[in-house]
């Protein structure tokens, strides 16, 4: 983790925490994430098919950043959503969302980030995901595109 | 601190926390920060030559905002990085990064912010810094440009 | 809360926390917020006339996101501020602020978000508010525009 091994966790420090980074072989929605290598954290939360699975009800700070870029700007509308799914409920619930329109000069190389972060009351078995409107415009560098949470 | 003196800290509340604000009279990288006056916080973490020095291993939420602005837009590529250095490791590690290209209308007065924030497992003696691609375009108002962290 | 009722809070979990969402009948500054329905949280903090009222001195992470959009871009300068007011002090204190200028192509439909988040030492009876420069350009969807905090 960050260039050095994790310290042995103290008993009290079994924090519910995750920090997942961009995975460039994502081909479909929701986005998939690197959950093993690099500056990744995953403790007391499970990762399954793009989603963070809550296993303890409580308050969580949830965040995500997505880095969009392209070779030639055509101002395709961009959206970045963090949403929640639970088998007890029929519909996805959008927790946080960012949208961009008319954000670059036509024809130019462009780059832009979207950041989301807030507190939510989550229930055991909730699955959290990230969705974007245009996968081909996402850059998946670990420092640029990420998804995480921690239990307060 | 925010217009009123800090309360006497309770014994349990020796929180590892920092909130540093922009310091305008510097031309060096990494960015230097105001660590004394205004809405600054620094407790259980040291500040040294632009860096926050971790003295207790654990999980930290780290954040930074930088406010870029200019009088006449030429779309100079902008980057904003939070990176980590530790004497045991040869290379800086970029923890979070934001980039902007083609973000304003040529010739116009412009302004834009970059925000970064995420959880990391940090080790005692890690030094955290903020870097930008163009110092001349940063505005250092305390409410606009800042760097902070807290131990979970 | 997020599509399912809150669990009965455990004794220890009386967290000071708030997450308020956009309220479209805001007509004046500061912004007003939805404090009851949807993905709202309000515990150990009071909501009063657009403001979050602190009732326990300590360290808080405070955040806000505002979603601006318009039908026809004229690059009206945008600002988004989180500020603090306390009856003991004569003036509002701007804690965090984001500004945008020259951010879209003249005449086009446009959309952009501003995100702020940082740690502050707050005192009992502090009132926190959000201000924007142009209310008519704010979209108040609950996932897009919000204001929150939690005590560390």
């Amino acid at each position: 983790q960050i260039g050095h091994p994790s310290p042995p966790p103290e008993k009290k420090e079994l924090r519910k925490v995750a920090h997942l980074t961009g995975k460039s072989n994502s081909r479909s929605m929701p986005l998939e994430w690197e959950d093993t290598y690099g500056i990744v954290l995953l403790s007391g939360v499970k990762y399954k098919k793009g989603g963070l699975v809550i296993n303890e009800t409580g308050l969580y700070f949830v965040y995500s950043k997505v880095y969009f870029r392209g070779q030639s700007c055509n101002n395709l509308p961009l959206s970045h959503k963090v949403y929640m799914r639970n088998s007890k409920y029929p519909q996805d619930l959008v927790m946080m969302e960012g949208k961009m329109m008319s954000y670059c000069t036509t024809g130019q190389m462009w780059a832009r980030s979207s950041y989301l972060g807030a507190v939510f009351n989550l229930t055991s078995a909730d699955h959290l995901y990230v969705n974007v409107s245009e996968l081909s415009l996402v850059n998946f560098e670990e420092s640029q595109t990420f998804f995480g949470l921690y239990k307060l | 601190q925010i217009g009123h003196p800090s309360p006497p800290p309770e014994k349990k509340e020796l929180r590892k926390v920092a909130h540093l604000t922009g310091k305008s009279n510097s031309r060096s990288m990494p960015l230097e920060w105001e660590d004394t006056y205004g809405i600054v916080l620094l407790s259980g973490v040291k500040y040294k030559k632009g860096g926050l020095v971790i003295n207790e291993t654990g999980l930290y939420f780290v954040y930074s905002k930088v406010y870029f602005r200019g009088q006449s837009c030429n779309n100079l590529p902008l980057s904003h990085k939070v990176y980590m250095r530790n004497s045991k490791y040869p290379q800086d590690l970029v923890m979070m990064e934001g980039k902007m290209m083609s973000y304003c209308t040529t010739g116009q007065m412009w302004a834009r912010s970059s925000y970064l924030g995420a959880v990391f497992n940090l080790t005692s003696a890690d030094h955290l810094y903020v870097n930008v691609s163009e110092l001349s375009l940063v505005n250092f108002e305390e409410s606009q440009t800042f760097f902070g962290l807290y131990k979970l | 809360q997020i599509g399912h009722p809150s669990p009965p809070p455990e004794k220890k979990e009386l967290r000071k926390v708030a997450h308020l969402t956009g309220k479209s009948n805001s007509r004046s500054m500061p912004l007003e917020w939805e404090d009851t329905y949807g993905i709202v949280l309000l515990s150990g903090v009071k909501y009063k006339k657009g403001g979050l009222v602190i009732n326990e001195t300590g360290l808080y992470f405070v955040y806000s996101k505002v979603y601006f959009r318009g039908q026809s871009c004229n690059n009206l300068p945008l600002s988004h501020k989180v500020y603090m007011r306390n009856s003991k002090y004569p003036q509002d204190l701007v804690m965090m602020e984001g500004k945008m200028m020259s951010y879209c192509t003249t005449g086009q439909m446009w959309a952009r978000s501003s995100y702020l988040g940082a740690v502050f030492n707050l005192t009992s009876a502090d009132h926190l508010y959000v201000n924007v420069s142009e209310l008519s350009l704010v979209n108040f969807e609950e996932s897009q525009t919000f204001f929150g905090l939690y005590k560390l």
Partner: antibody, heavy 119, light 111 residues
Framework: EVQLQQSGPELVKPGASVKLSCKAS????????ISWVRQRPEQGLEWIGW????????QYNENFKGKATLTTDKSSGTAYMQLNRLTSEDSAVYFC????????????WGQGTTLTVSS | DIVLTQSPASLAVSLGQRATISCRAS??????????IHWYQQKPGLPPKLLIF???HLESGVPARFSGSGSGTDFTLNIHPVEEEDAATYYC?????????FGGGTKLEIK
């Protein structure tokens, strides 16, 4: 509008010193470097050094150490370059230019001051 | 010091045609983020004017017929289509390290 207005032409004798000025306007003087560049007759461009008006820090090209001294007056938004122990080799056009701190490109230039060193 | 070598020293190009100027650095002037090469135009009796920064970015107000490319040690300035007013001397400059240095210049004549 960003402008750099340089002082007029100078004719000085060998061995003397001269102080050239560059008055900046239209931007925040303390947020950008001011660089100085020499151009000898029919020759290319040589970077002399920069000064950061924010804190007065300077950096010189080794070839000009001891020859050039850079200073600023923040109150008037003026940068100065003093050249000492002048010889005919110092005859040139001297430009000041605003330079971005990190990218270090020269995005606005003064009109130039012609220095002639002759007895 | 990083030495920048421009070629050719001079060239003559017909109106409407393409002018290509090369700038070679004695060592790399690129990082993982940017290439620290800038291009200037200078006309007689006037100061230089910034055209291209960071190898490929067009300065505000500069016509789109100017373009820059390259990375590492090899960089190119292209002008297409060349116009009468482009007759000038062109310089590359690096800002990868101190001291900043300029290329020797390329004089463009319009035929």
């Amino acid at each position: 509008e960003v402008q750099l207005q340089q002082s007029g032409p100078e004719l000085v004798k060998p061995g003397a010193s001269v102080k050239l000025s560059c008055k900046a306007s239209g931007y925040t003087f303390t947020r950008f470097d001011i660089s100085w560049v020499r151009q000898r007759p029919e020759q290319g461009l040589e970077w002399i050094g920069w000064i950061f008006p924010g804190d007065g820090s300077t950096q010189y090209n080794e070839n000009f150490k001891g020859k050039a001294t850079l200073t600023t007056d923040k109150s008037s938004g003026t940068a100065y370059m003093q050249l000492n122990r002048l010889t005919s080799e110092d005859s040139a056009v001297y430009f000041c230019a605003r330079s971005l701190i990190s990218t270090a490109m020269f995005d606005h230039w003064g009109q130039g001051t012609t220095l002639t060193v002759s007895s | 010091d990083i030495v920048l070598t421009q070629s050719p020293a001079s060239l003559a190009v017909s109106l409407g045609q393409r002018a290509t100027i090369s700038c070679r650095a004695s060592k790399s002037v690129s990082t993982s983020d940017f290439s620290y090469i800038h291009w200037y135009q200078q006309k007689p009796g006037l100061p230089p004017k910034l055209l291209i920064f960071l190898a490929s970015h067009l300065e505000s107000g500069v016509p789109a017929r100017f373009s820059g490319s390259g990375s590492g040690t090899d960089f190119t300035l292209n002008i297409h289509p060349v116009e009468e007013e482009d007759a000038a001397t062109y310089y590359c400059q690096h800002s990868r390290e101190l001291p900043r240095t300029f290329g020797g210049g390329t004089k463009l004549e319009i035929k």
